[in-house]
Amino acid sequence: SEGRKTWRRRGQQPPPPPRTEAAPAAGQPVESFPLDFTAVEGNMDSFMAQVKSLAQSLYPCSAQQLNEDLRLHLLLNTSVTCNDGSPAGYYLKESRGSRRWLLFLEGGWYCFNRENCDSRYDTMRRLMSSRDWPRTRTGTGILSSQPEENPYWWNANMVFIPYCSSDVWSGASSKSEKNEYAFMGALIIQEVVRELLGRGLSGAKVLLLAGSSAGGTGVLLNVDRVAEQLEKLGYPAIQVRGLADSGWFLDNKQYRHTDCVDTITCAPTEAIRRGIRYWNGVVPERCRRQFQEGEEWNCFFGYKVYPTLRCPVFVVQWLFDEAQLTVDNVHLTGQPVQEGLRLYIQNLGRELRHTLKDVPASFAPACLSHEIIIRSHWTDVQVKGTSLPRALHCWDRSLHDSHKASKTPLKGCPVHLVDSCPWPHCNPSCPTVRDQFTGQEMNVAQFLMHMGFDMQTVAQPQGLEPSELLGMLSNGS
């Protein structure tokens, strides 16, 4: 992957040797190179000092004067619009030395009828209109151009596509006399791709369509269509891949059933069923034909659509996703959790883990959280000792010129990383939890006790005393 070399003095663990890729054709930029240290073995410290000085002087060039901003471009084709008819658009930061393009789909729930779309327009207009969008945005997490923050793809061309269609990126209907709102999520993606071809995407080697939450589901719904679009436009050599963060939901039974009144309380199956009709939603063709007419909502659920996808997709999902819990009517209010709810939450983690068993490229930490890839600290969480950027790097390597066919995992470079411990925050690298009312940070032990876990029953399967377990959790081990 494109990442700055990390220099270590002797005595520290050396990095794995860089993997040399096939030499690029003449005129193509070189994105990685092997280093041979044999000639400087005797005087490594002085050599390192020179390299460090060189790196520091060159760094501003590669980081393009450290300007982190992505610049807004409204679509030239103004018929492809946000909900209110204003033109959709994208934020772009080019990296001319790179043939990698990252297109990120923003998330932000959805609305599925006139009433809750009106309410959304009043309270969250930015998610329905481009009228007040800022001229620039800062790239964070996987969209950052800083190697420290984004060791995975810091040098890629970065594109942030704001979510202003409220349709989980699936809609294909324009605003008219009859339709108060336009729902053009699927068309926005197609148009952005079309316009980016004229801005350098035509020379891409890899296009990674990424997204978080509703944007993560949007990846699953659109990644194959983008690949098909590029093929039809005469760019079959661009490898299209997907990265779906926090968009792999379950159509499970709610903890407490509520009527479909608003976006949050409506069971996801019912919300999507209504939404598809309202948005004129489109789903991947290969998935659609597996279900009867009117049952296309099934294709919004990762475990049902994933087996029908042709592009390689990496799935990132917290085992205890806050958005999933919200639609399941689980609200952790600060009161200690009763046993029935605790068992429900544990079972949710188990079910989610089960749906990922046949997903070779996945990263699923046992944490209570939502979204990760554009958080600045997205590098912190680990599953079985591997961070997400490292797992993505391994995924890139496993796909190198082989697409989805590669079956053998690379030694020491895992891509299937799903936590097996059974309760929220049993992974000590989980993001810190805050008490919903006091805002104070809770350590894992406090959180588990707050969740109503009896330390005795938690410690026993680990062969530990409760005091030992508490110590380990408090130390973050």
């Epitope: 597996q290 087996p307 042709r310 989805k404 066919a405």
Partner: antibody
């Protein structure tokens, strides 16, 4: 275990139609597609069409005007009908199951219905 | 339509040999290719799907490789029960199409 059983006539007059029923067991038609493939010495294996689990169909354009496929989920049956038969439609006709997947291949086949078109 | 050209059309080998059958697609089909075995008087049986994945119950002496337009089926340590005709099939686009077959016999 997974089985596809075919029933249909062996001999049909030219210009008449062929009807074959494929009755499946060991899986549900609401979860799997069923394809139709024929095999003749002159043309080898030819794909004719498919009935998807959702109830939609796809046909080989070369046969679309005279082919129809339907099904009854409750009876676990898929029906194949081809009109205006000619001598070169003489072949073995197979139904075959297609898994829920990202491309079409056939993991289980029926034993075939041998058809001769002759007056 | 995508044409699938299989070669050789017939092949004679000895027991214990390793043989290779190739299949060439007229356009890029990625890895969307399957291999079938058909014994005389029987229906085709799936051996390999997605270019290299062995179907359940198929002996490990069968293997598949390739992507794009060129694919191979390899049978190592040839056994008497491998006498059959072998077909490739593309699943990239409709209409689905098959190779003309390779008839394998034992010397």
């Amino acid at each position: 275990q997974v089985q596809l059983k075919q029933s249909g006539p062996g001999l049909v007059q030219p210009s008449q139609s062929l009807s074959i029923t494929c009755t499946v067991s060991g899986f549900s038609l609401t979860n799997y597609g069923v394809h139709w493939v024929r095999q003749s010495p002159g043309k080898g294996l030819e794909w004719l069409g498919v009935m998807w689990s959702g109830g939609s169909t796809d046909y080989n354009v070369a046969f679309i005007s005279r082919l129809s496929i339907s099904k009854d989920n409750s009876k676990s049956q898929v029906f194949f009908k081809m009109n205006s038969l000619q001598a070169d439609d003489t072949a073995i006709y197979y139904c075959a199951r297609s898994p829920y997947s990202n491309y079409d291949y056939f993991d289980y086949w029926g034993r075939g219905t041998t058809l001769t078109v002759s007056s | 339509d995508i044409q699938m050209n299989q070669s050789p059309s017939s092949l004679s080998a000895s027991l214990g040999d390793t043989i290779t059958i190739t299949c060439h697609a007229s356009q890029n089909i990625n890895v969307w290719l399957s291999w079938y075995q058909q014994k005389p008087g029987n229906f085709p049986k799936l051996l390999i799907f997605k270019a290299s994945n062995l179907h359940t119950g198929v002996p490990s002496r069968f293997s598949g490789s390739g992507s794009g337009t060129g694919f191979t089926l390899t049978i190592s340590n040839l056994q008497p029960e491998d006498i059959a005709t072998y077909y490739c099939q593309q699943g990239q686009s409709y209409p689905l199409t098959f190779g003309g077959g390779t008839q394998l016999e034992i010397k």
